[in-house]
Interface confidence: low
């Protein structure tokens, strides 16, 4: 299990390193993104973990950002981030149905209402359980 | 009404043990981070630990492996452990709520506890 | 990692003046920090979340400002009941911390 585990985040911050670099290839990060939505968490160990990653890197104010599966619904008021950036990424993951193109990809300033807490835990304890 | 109340401050030896309690009201420990701090007398605020919704915690580096935080979703209620207690460890200790999004501050706060660490 | 610095540790002011406290972090923390009042004997209280976000209750004569390493906190005309210790504290990151607070601000009367 131990090595499972180890796998595990091997792979996971495998693919939060290559996020969205190759739009041909997007199995894992929808598996990743279905994690992040469903354990409403946000990274491996913490929600920084994306702000490493070049493809979610602009410029300046917004140099921080992460995928919309790490933004938490239930906290927000802003409709307009709502029904334009967020709703419409959450769906697909929703219904895990069309595989996502590159230009889908969908990141919100990390300033908004992100996850507190990486998925490790919880990905952790759902191997424990299982 | 949303409310923390601590209890289990006191005196205690140098070296010794003690466990703070927190018992929350009028929301569920298990959807939140929730957080110890302590205020040595006539001193700042300082950060203890934290425990995640999921149950994954931090500590300050200073409380690793002396402190230990936990709690039990049925009782709704938060604990500190803290062992080999030093006279530096006198302070009131509070339990904050911080919540679930990254961002949210520490509200609201218990009264606090006083522990006290001398011979 | 992620230390606070806060500034001045003491400011002398009377009812009605214009008083700044700042906190300077030392990595850029975006803008999660808070702000808290506490006075002697109580439990602080969240004035201010989100760097600029005033907290429920709150009256408006507080303001937060700032981003990245720099923050203000801002009473546009000093009351009565203002006259307390004011902290900062950082909500960026929990892991490898010494503290996540600024080291306090008192506010006292001049």
């Known amino acids: 299990r131990a090595q499972l585990e180890r796998s595990l985040r091997d792979v996971v911050e495998k693919t939060i390193q290559k996020y969205g670099t190759n739009p041909e290839e997007t199995a894992a990060e929808e598996s990743w993104d279905y994690v992040q939505f469903q354990l409403r968490c946000c990274g491996w160990h913490y929600p920084q973990d994306w702000f490493q990653v070049l493809i979610l890197r602009g410029n300046g104010s917004e140099a921080h950002r992460v995928p919309c599966s790490c933004y938490n619904l239930s906290a927000t008021n802003d409709s307009t981030i709502l029904d334009k950036v967020i709703l419409p990424q959450l769906s697909r993951l929703g219904h895990l149905a069309r595989s996502r193109h590159s230009a889908d990809i969908c990141a919100v300033p990390a300033e908004s209402h992100i996850y507190r807490e990486g998925c490790a835990q919880g990905l952790q304890k759902w191997l424990h359980n299982n | 009404e949303v409310q923390l109340v601590e209890s289990g401050g006191g005196l205690v030896q140098p070296g010794g043990s003690l466990r703070l309690s927190c018992a929350a009201s009028?929301?569920?420990?298990?959807?939140?981070?929730m957080n110890w701090v302590r205020q040595a007398p006539g001193k700042g605020l300082e950060w203890v630990s934290i425990i995640f919704a999921s149950g994954r915690t931090d500590y300050a580096s200073w409380a690793k492996g002396r402190f230990t935080i936990s709690r039990d979703n049925s009782k709704n209620t938060l604990y500190l452990q803290m062992n080999s207690l030093r006279a530096e460890d006198t302070a009131v200790y509070y339990c904050?709520?911080?919540?679930?999004?990254?961002?949210?501050?520490?509200?609201?706060w218990g009264q606090g506890t006083l522990v006290t660490v001398s011979s | 990692a992620y230390d606070m610095t806060q500034s001045p540790s003491t400011l002398s002011a009377s009812v009605g003046d214009r008083v700044t406290i700042t906190c300077q972090a030392s990595?850029?923390?975006?803008?999660?920090l808070a702000w808290y009042q506490q006075k002697p004997g109580k439990a602080p209280k969240l004035l201010i979340h989100k760097a600029s976000t005033l907290a429920s209750g709150v009256p408006s004569r507080f303001k937060g400002s700032g981003s990245g390493t720099e923050f203000t906190l801002t009473i546009s005309s000093l009351q009565p009941d203002d006259f307390a210790t004011y902290y900062c504290q950082q909500g960026y990151s929990n892991s490898n911390i010494d503290n996540t607070f600024g080291g306090g601000t008192k506010v006292e009367i001049k």
């Open positions: 009028g929301f569920s420990l298990s959807y939140n981070a």
């Open positions: 904050a709520r911080e919540g679930s999004t990254w961002g949210d501050a520490l509200d609201p």
């Open positions: 990595q850029n923390i975006i803008d999660y």
